[in-house]
């Protein structure tokens, strides 16, 4: 058993049929010694008396808010949550496996630049009685500070018969050094509580591996005289790190016909313009990627040819 | 060339070669986090590689003030990786074909380090840890770790030379 926060405790249980469970001793936070009784949740049934209460925690029915009273007055509370371990593996019932980039990916994180700011998100099908708490650091043995906000519900989607909820959190490294080569990864830890179930999820990454620039901005076409060619131009996204002579991007320009089956013409360039042939009913799209490190491409910025 | 006394390197040549190094490093190990081996082996194996850290003056302001600190750090790293890529870690099994990007990477690391340091002048170089894994799986794990680390190192070096070519070239 360990303390998650004041008056909230997590009991770690090996979860299998007829498991013996864990013996837990609760102590009432009071100077009083006599006349103390204990109850669980809203029940008025007295579970025991005395300053301490010893219970055998085996299942969710044994978890909940234990309260000690004296003469009708509440003295203190202890909320017990359960953390299940099945076949040596901690349960992951609350969050959905996003399976990208690999199986058992529950947390996904992205950064728009090298400033040390990043966003993480996760998915669940649970709609109520759900709380999240997020902590982060750079490195684990001698951790350096990363400050995370509160996790918020950022999107709701219908997937078949189920509703899916996306939560996200923004974090910022306290003393970021955008130009340095990271040697210690960022660690992100999410505590999830659904009713009386506790689970924790972690992710470890370098900012450079989660970089995904915003799409290029101000995408424009300029027809070239007496030609089917056009000059496409664009600018670095506002959110990208500066100076651009140091934090450079590379770009992919694509000409795509109306039909998905039509052949795509692609050009790669380090410049912020390119000359392409604009076919009727086609569209021109441009996306960006860090020039020197192959992290994710941005989403496409697009304009129609006509 | 970054000769002693603080004269400038051939920024544009360094820029071109460092960008080529980035491409080669990603050709040699294009995939991220796909290894079944990643949980195995000793984490200490690549902890000794030289990193370009915050105080090394490789940020735009540091380069403007005095690029020598940063160039020396980059040179140290290039020599370190060049030695690793020429070692048994990369020559033993699993076999690399003669068209492997590792061979070109090795040559380009040497080429860039020579651009930064002419004959007759020696910056201090970091000691290479004596890593001599006997098993193919240990060797492969080390290769992947070294190449991932090299990708990060050459990305910073390429940014330095791109910025230098754009803002510090005579």
């Amino acid at each position: 058993i360990w303390e998650l926060k004041k008056d909230v405790y997590v009991v770690e249980l090996d979860w299998y049929p007829d498991a013996p469970g864990e013996m837990v001793v609760l102590t009432c936070d009071t100077p009083e010694e006599d006349g103390i009784t204990w109850t669980l949740d809203q029940s008025s049934e007295v579970l025991g008396s005395g300053k301490t209460l010893t219970i055998q925690v085996k299942e969710f029915g044994d978890a909940g808010q234990y309260t000690c009273h004296k003469g009708g007055e509440v003295l203190s509370h202890s909320l017990l949550l359960l953390h299940k371990k099945e076949d040596g593996i901690w349960s992951t019932d609350i969050l959905k496996d996003q399976k990208e980039p690999k199986n058992k990916t529950f947390l996904r994180c992205e950064a728009k630049n090298y400033s040390g700011r990043f966003t993480c998100w996760w998915l669940t099908t649970i709609s109520t009685d759900l709380t999240f708490s997020v902590k982060s650091s750079r490195g684990s043995s001698d951790p350096q500070g990363v400050t995370c906000g509160a996790a918020t519900l950022s999107a709701e989607r219908v997937r078949g018969d189920n509703k899916e909820y996306e939560y996200s959190v923004e974090c910022q490294e306290d003393s970021a050094c955008p130009a340095a080569e990271e040697s210690l990864p960022i660690e992100v830890m999410v505590d999830a509580v659904h009713k009386l179930k506790y689970e924790n999820y972690t992710s470890s990454f370098f900012i450079r591996d989660i970089i995904k620039p915003d799409p290029p901005k101000n995408l424009q076409l300029k027809p070239l005289k007496n030609s089917r060619q056009v000059e496409v131009s664009w600018e670095y996204p506002d959110t990208w790190s500066t100076p651009h002579s140091y934090f450079s991007l590379t770009f992919c320009v694509q000409v795509q016909g109306k039909s998905k089956r039509e052949k795509k013409d692609r050009v790669f360039t380090d410049k912020t313009s390119a000359t392409v042939i604009c076919r009727k009913n086609a569209s021109i799209s441009v996306r960006a990627q860090d020039r020197y490190y192959s992290s994710s491409w941005s989403e496409w910025a697009s304009v129609p040819c006509s | 060339r970054a000769v002693p006394g603080g004269s400038s390197p051939a920024w544009t040549q360094c820029q071109q070669l460092s960008q080529k190094l980035c491409t080669l490093a990603w050709s040699a190990h294009p995939l991220v986090g796909h290894m079944d081996l990643r949980e195995e082996g000793d984490e200490e194996t690549t902890n000794d590689v030289p990193h370009i850290q915050c105080g090394d003056g490789c940020d735009p302001q540091g380069l403007r003030d005095n690029s020598q600190f940063c160039l020396q750090r980059i040179h140290q790293g290039l020599i370190f990786y060049e030695k690793l890529l020429g070692s048994d870690i990369f020559t033993g099994e699993p076999s690399l074909l003669p068209d492997s990007p590792v061979g070109q990477l090795h040559a380009s690391l040497l080429g860039l380090s020579q651009l930064l340091q002419p004959e007759g002048h020696h910056w201090e170089t970091q000691q290479i840890p004596s890593l001599s894994p006997s098993q193919p799986w240990q060797r492969l794990l080390l290769r992947f770790k070294i190449l991932r680390s090299l990708q990060a190192f050459v990305a910073v070096a390429a940014r330095v030379f791109a910025h230098g070519a754009a803002t510090l070239s005579p």
Partner: antibody, heavy 120, light 107 residues
Framework: QVQLVQSGAEVKKPGSSVKVSCKAS????????MHWMRQAPGQGLEWIGY????????KYNENFKGKVTITADKSTSTAYMELSSLRSEDTAVYYC?????????????WGQGTLVTVSS | EIVMTQSPATLSVSPGERATLSCKAS??????VAWYQQKPGQAPRLLLF???TRHTGIPARFSGSGSRTEFTLTISSLQSEDFAVYYC?????????FGGGTKVEIK
Amino acid sequence: QVQLVQSGAEVKKPGSSVKVSCKASGYTFTAQTMHWMRQAPGQGLEWIGYIYPRDGSTKYNENFKGKVTITADKSTSTAYMELSSLRSEDTAVYYCAIPDRSGYAWFIVWGQGTLVTVSS
Amino acid sequence: EIVMTQSPATLSVSPGERATLSCKASRDVAIAVAWYQQKPGQAPRLLLFWASTRHTGIPARFSGSGSRTEFTLTISSLQSEDFAVYYCHQYSSYPFTFGGGTKVEIK
């Protein structure tokens, strides 16, 4: 796209030689090693060897040394595999293939195969 | 040379079922193993490399695992087009070698 097109089927007498060609397109021929495999009827695959067209260097499976010669013509982006002193056991489908560009020998593109039949 | 031993030689499976193919190397090959699919009259087609990484365009029902000497190819739910011969291949040591193949046939 990358393609490897092999020469047609051959029927040869024991003791003679045969030269199978593999024409490459869609990539820089000199930049990658070209490998040869064989598959006897109803059997598994055997790696014969490779040539690196950039410098002409070759490496052979010991089991095929003296039996096989691999060459390449840079001007036509074509690799050749010559089998000498043919015996009935050399009856097989011969494949050319190129590996991934990371420098390890998993084979991403294969020729369609050339059946060589050795029969008197 | 490294001997790659595949088992079983033939696997009879119903469409929609799971198929598990085994490959054992006579010595440590790290994860330098590829898997190929071959249909009659066709050249082999690459499925996986580094023991578990799917080649471009290969469906997610194909997965691989293992390291050093023991490797597995799993086809989670067999489709009609998956009935073929499967070969494992080590590219750790010269001469590169292939397993004898496992024929996956319709039950």
